[in-house]
């Protein structure tokens, strides 16, 4: 267990041109406050996933009124640190979001109004117990300067706050197997405190508060022997000593989520989906109102009408969830028609359309033949978002611009020779065959299966295919 601490040093215009306008005015005095959200690991899921490590809200800063004509200075800040307690081990790598909020104190109907001025996010490595780390982040024309650290709460020590220290019981040495607690050399590392009730014979722990079972034992406290009866549907390795292994406790067993939160298993642990009005790793943080700035991603907070709707977040496009914490996968709704590719750009959806389709959602089937002439007497045929030319004899290619080789398909039968001709092809038939494609055998008595050849053409002469 421990505390992540954030100290805001300044919030004001960043360097360079385009200084932002002051967020407050004589007509609309305002004050700032900050919100920090922490998540374990170096995940990219900065804005939309829950603040699994915790979240905190600063006090309100002093009321500020802009001096007319003066550039926006560094704005007056709230006193004190933002502190995010963490109950479990410090993960070492974490993602953060720091939001700067403006509270307008003008004559609004219905009390003060909140708006998000800036949001910065980042991913960092940090060992607990180390010195303050300084950082500068920019959001648009604004610049935020801050420091942060993670410190363990006694008796925890170490870079992950997982080792426990106790004062020495004997002046000279620690107990068997226990080392001195650097840097607190006058204290000794304490044995891990497992989950209350964890069986000392059959359970052990590697983290405070857990209870892991030795082989052959199961249950949340490792007090239940694994069944040795024969298994109808084995769920794990079986051996002569343990028989069939029933699954050990899952991370959601006993539902670790408080206040009606629902638990879902994740690859490494569990995640609580909290009802409105609660948040935190186990939905343990309650009593949230709009004054706590519970809406993420620029969501607008309005007061709810009963304790189960303590506040309501009206989410901006692209976000959902009771705290606007989930990014909507808008492409999952398959908005692009006719096989278009969907791109979610965050601020907008784009559809990349297949050839022959257009429109914001690829809903328009283009007239494939419009403005597309087929050359050399070909005719255009529409189909499937693309156009095709049916070419006149002797021409080919996409637009009938290529002169076709009529002999390419070997149209003359029975060994006839093919000759390309300006109006088509001519077959010179082998002896004994006749017809436009040499398809008819000549009868042995000199007659043929066709009418007599026209005058001037003897059987065996080339027959022009008209």
């Amino acid at each position: 267990a421990g505390v992540f601490e954030l100290q805001i040093h300044s919030f004001g215009p960043g360097p360079g041109p385009g200084a932002p306008r002051s967020p407050c005015s004589a007509r609309l005095p305002c004050r700032l406050f900050f919100r920090v959200c922490l998540k374990p690991g170096l995940s990219e899921e900065a804005a939309e996933s829950p603040c699994a490590l915790g979240a905190a809200l600063s006090a309100r800063g002093p009321v500020y009124t802009e001096q007319p004509g003066a550039p926006a200075p560094d704005l007056p800040l709230p006193d004190g640190l933002l502190q995010v307690p963490f109950r479990d081990a410090w993960p070492g790598t974490f993602s953060f979001i720091i939001e700067t909020w403006r509270e307008e104190l003008g004559d609004q109907i219905g009390g003060p109004a909140w708006s998000l001025l800036a949001r910065v996010a980042g991913r960092r490595r940090l060992a607990a117990g180390g010195p303050w780390a300084r950082d500068i982040q920019r959001a648009g024309a604004w610049e935020l300067r801050f420091s942060y650290r993670a410190r363990c709460e006694p008796p925890a020590v170490g870079t992950a706050c997982t080792r426990l220290c106790r004062p020495r019981s004997a002046p000279s040495r620690c107990g068997p197997g226990l080392r001195p607690c650097a840097p607190l050399e006058d204290e000794c590392e304490a044995p891990l405190v497992c989950r209350a009730g964890c069986s000392p014979e059959h359970g052990f722990c590697e983290q405070p508060g857990e209870c892991r079972c030795l082989e052959g034992w199961t249950g949340p406290l490792c007090t239940v022997p694994v069944s040795t009866s024969s298994c109808l549907s084995p769920r794990g390795p079986s051996s002569a000593t343990t028989g069939c292994l029933v699954p050990g406790p899952g991370p959601c067993d006993g539902n670790p989520c408080a206040n009606g939160g629902s638990c879902s298993e994740t690859p490494r642990s569990f995640e609580c989906t909290c009802p409105r009005g609660f948040y935190g790793l186990r939905c343990e943080v309650s009593g949230v109102t709009c004054a706590d700035g519970p809406c993420f991603n620029g969501g607008l907070c309005v007061g709810g009408a009963d304790p189960d709707s303590a506040y309501i977040c009206h989410c901006p496009p692209g976000f959902q969830g009771s705290n606007c914490e989930k990014r909507v996968d808008r492409c999952s709704l398959q908005p692009c028609r006719n096989g278009g590719l969907c791109l979610d750009l965050g601020h907008a959806l784009r559809c990349r359309c297949r050839a022959g389709f257009a429109g914001p959602r690829c809903e328009h089937d283009l007239d494939d033949c419009a403005g597309r002439a087929c050359a050399n007497g070909g005719t255009c045929v529409e189909g499937g978002g693309a156009h095709r030319c049916s070419c006149a004899l002797g021409f080919g290619g996409r637009d009938c611009r290529e002169r076709a080789d009529p002999c390419a398909a070997r149209p003359c039968a029975h060994g006839g020779r093919c000759y390309a001709h300006f109006s088509g092809l001519v077959c010179a038939c082998a002896p004994g065959y006749m017809g436009a494609r040499c398809e008819f055998p000549v009868h042995p008595d000199g007659a043929s299966a066709l009418p007599a050849a026209p005058p001037g053409l003897r059987p065996g002469d080339p027959q022009r295919y008209l």
Partner: antibody
Framework: EVQLVETGGGLVQPKGSLKLSCAVS????????MNWVRQAPGKGLEWVAR??????????YYADSVKDRFTISRDDSQSMLYLQMNNLKIEDTAMYYC????????WGQGTLVTVSA | QAVVTQESALTTSPGETVTLTCRSS?????????ANWIQEKPDHLFTGLIG???NRAPGVPARFSGSLIGDKAALTITGAQTEDEAIYFC?????????FGGGTKLTVL
């Protein structure tokens, strides 16, 4: 538009029973706590009962005047709210409204319960 | 059991500003009471006006506003209209129990 339609009211004798129903449409019924509120003739409003949602284990709460006589329940699959009224008294005569609170209070049109000998 | 008290009757003129209040017997009304204001017109026609102390319902005219004034919840009608003549109830939540005030009969003369 959110709609709450109450049915089941009527004339009943003292110590009798009646079951009111409320059909809900156009919002995610499963998410919200639901309430029954009543108004006796010529009187003000009185909250009667409340049932929370599944994630709050369908916890129920009652006004002292109806405790142990009335039972509030819900059927999330049908988006229905119910009020089972037993051992009715003359002072239970009122218009009964199905109500839920979100950003403000949403009301049904009511159903009249008359308890009379 | 908490008791919620409202003015029994108020009279105002068209165009005037009038404030109805809602007091709790348990102490100051806070945002944790999620003050709700409901309008009743003849024939049992109820309309939710304000939820969560100051959240005006969609379609409710901007002249209606909710707030906390001192230790009470308040409904202010800025520039009352004749059609605002009605009975106004406030409801306060105490954990999971809702308590209504007796209602204020507003007359707009």
């Amino acid at each position: 538009e959110v709609q709450l339609v109450e049915t089941g009211g009527g004339l009943v004798q003292p110590k009798g029973s009646l079951k009111l129903s409320c059909a809900v449409s156009a919002f995610t019924f499963t998410t919200y706590a639901m309430n029954w509120v009543r108004q006796a003739p010529g009187k003000g409003l009185e909250w009667v009962a409340r049932i929370r949602n599944k994630s709050n284990n369908y916890a129920t709460y009652y006004a002292d005047s109806v405790k142990d006589r009335f039972t509030i329940s819900r059927d999330d699959s049908q988006s229905m709210l119910y009020l089972q009224m037993n051992n009715l008294k003359i002072e239970d005569t009122a218009m009964y409204y199905c109500v839920f609170h979100y950003d403000y209070v949403y009301w049904g049109q009511g159903t009249l319960v008359t308890v009379s000998a | 059991q908490a008791v919620v008290t409202q003015e029994s009757a108020l009279t105002t003129s068209p165009g005037e500003t009038v404030t109805l209040t809602c007091r709790s017997s348990t102490g100051a009304v806070t945002t944790s009471n999620y003050a709700n204001w409901i309008q009743e017109k003849p024939d049992h026609l109820f309309t939710g006006l304000i939820g969560g102390t100051n959240n005006r319902a969609p379609g409710v005219p901007a002249r209606f506003s909710g707030s906390l004034i001192g230790d009470k919840a308040a409904l202010t009608i800025t520039g009352a209209q004749t059609e605002d003549e009605a009975i106004y109830f406030c409801g306060l939540w105490y954990s999971n129990h809702l308590v209504f005030g007796g209602g204020t009969k507003l007359t707009v003369l």
